[in-house]
């Protein structure tokens, strides 16, 4: 019987010879659970596992803890891969995180973190980041040190308010912090002075809601 080949991430897919962008099935080692992820095989050498994408407002990102845990949306379009999968993956080896951003004026920028991982669900999928470079700000728009993940039904932020309800979307909110890539999607010419938009403060400033975002990870030794 032919052995089934499985891939833990898009870097393994790439190294196996599949070098075309698209949706691939990923499976963690010692697991039977599969997830569908979009693989970017072109940008910066390829092998990137897309863990979040916003592009047109077609998917509702005001979701529950469980939905953010297991993932939602369409891997070919807007989606969230899932905190549990990303947590397990990023605790097995060292990963880098690249966040690619687009504004409504045709500009693009990125933030690259040389080390990224999420804590377990017991620790509320707290984000850990180190070593920022890139063009989307010299200061991290994800608050440092990293915060716990919060959703509309799980308030783990540092605010007297409930950030996820106030800003919408699940995120590593502080109180509430300089970013929220899972906020409300606003169309062009309606994207400024927004209290709950798609925010990356140290690139576009306050109240500016972005046109597009992609969060992608890849092993540091790729």
């Amino acid at each position: 019987k032919e052995e089934q080949i499985s891939f833990r991430d898009c870097a393994e897919v790439f190294k196996s010879g599949h070098t075309t962008n698209g949706v691939y099935t990923l499976t963690l080692p010692n697991s039977t659970e599969e997830v569908k992820a979009y693989c970017d095989m072109e940008a910066g050498g390829g092998g990137w596992t897309i863990i979040q994408r916003r592009e047109d407002g077609s998917v509702d990102f005001q979701r529950t803890w469980k939905e953010y845990k297991v993932g939602f949306g369409n891997p070919s379009g807007e989606y969230w891969l899932g905190n549990e999968f990303v947590s397990q993956l990023t605790n097995q080896q060292r990963y880098v995180l690249k966040i690619h951003l687009k504004d409504w004026e045709g500009n693009e920028a990125y933030s690259l973190y040389e080390h990224f991982y999420l804590s377990s669900e017991e620790l509320n999928y707290r984000i850990h980041l180190k070593g920022l470079t890139g063009t989307a700000g010299k200061i991290s728009s994800i608050s440092q040190p990293g915060n716990d993940f919060s959703t509309k039904d799980a308030d783990n932020d540092k605010c007297i308010c409930k950030c996820s309800q106030m800003l919408t979307g699940g995120w590593w909110f502080d109180a509430c912090g300089p970013s929220n890539l899972n906020g409300m999607y606003y169309p062009q010419r309606q994207n400024t002075n927004k209290f709950n938009g798609i925010k990356w403060y140290y690139w576009k400033g306050s109240g500016y809601s972005l046109k597009g975002t992609t969060m992608m990870i890849r092993p540091a030794d790729f």
Epitope: K158, C159, C161, A175, C176, K194, F195, G197, Y201, S206
Partner: nanobody, 129 residues
């Protein structure tokens, strides 16, 4: 649509006074804090004063304490900054900005700059003889 419109800037001699207004629309002041900020040429934007809770809580930067007074008229959805004893170093573009009042860190009284998501276009204040 959220809008903030500043007015009242102008040229004034050292020691003089001005009153700036910030008219808000698209939301009510009851649930928001309003901050005044200023930016001089070649310098970072800095916080000057802020108000929330219908005037129950106010903040002033050390550089303007005793000279500037912030107030609000919720019936007009407008916040004012009365500036007395003006100095040349007060010359700057003055902006007002809004943040949901509840967006406060536990134990803190005021808000980092990045929490203010709605901004006006600014009004120029020039203090010169």
């Amino acid at each position: 649509e959220v809008q903030l419109v500043e007015s009242g800037g102008g040229l004034v001699q050292p020691g003089g006074s001005l009153r700036l207004s910030c008219a808000a629309s698209g939301f009510t002041l009851d649930d928001y804090a309003i901050g005044w900020f200023r930016q001089a040429p070649g310098k970072e934007r800095e916080g000057v004063s802020a108000i929330r809770d219908n005037g129950g809580s106010t903040y002033y930067a050390d550089s303007v304490k005793g000279r500037f007074t912030i107030s609000s008229d919720n019936s007009k959805n407008t916040v004012y900054l009365q500036m007395n004893s003006l100095r040349p170093e007060d010359t700057a573009v003055y902006y007002c900005a809004a943040v949901p009042a509840g967006r406060l860190r536990f134990g803190e009284q005021w808000y980092p700059l990045y929490e203010y998501d709605a901004w006006g276009q600014g009004t120029l204040v020039t203090v010169s003889s």
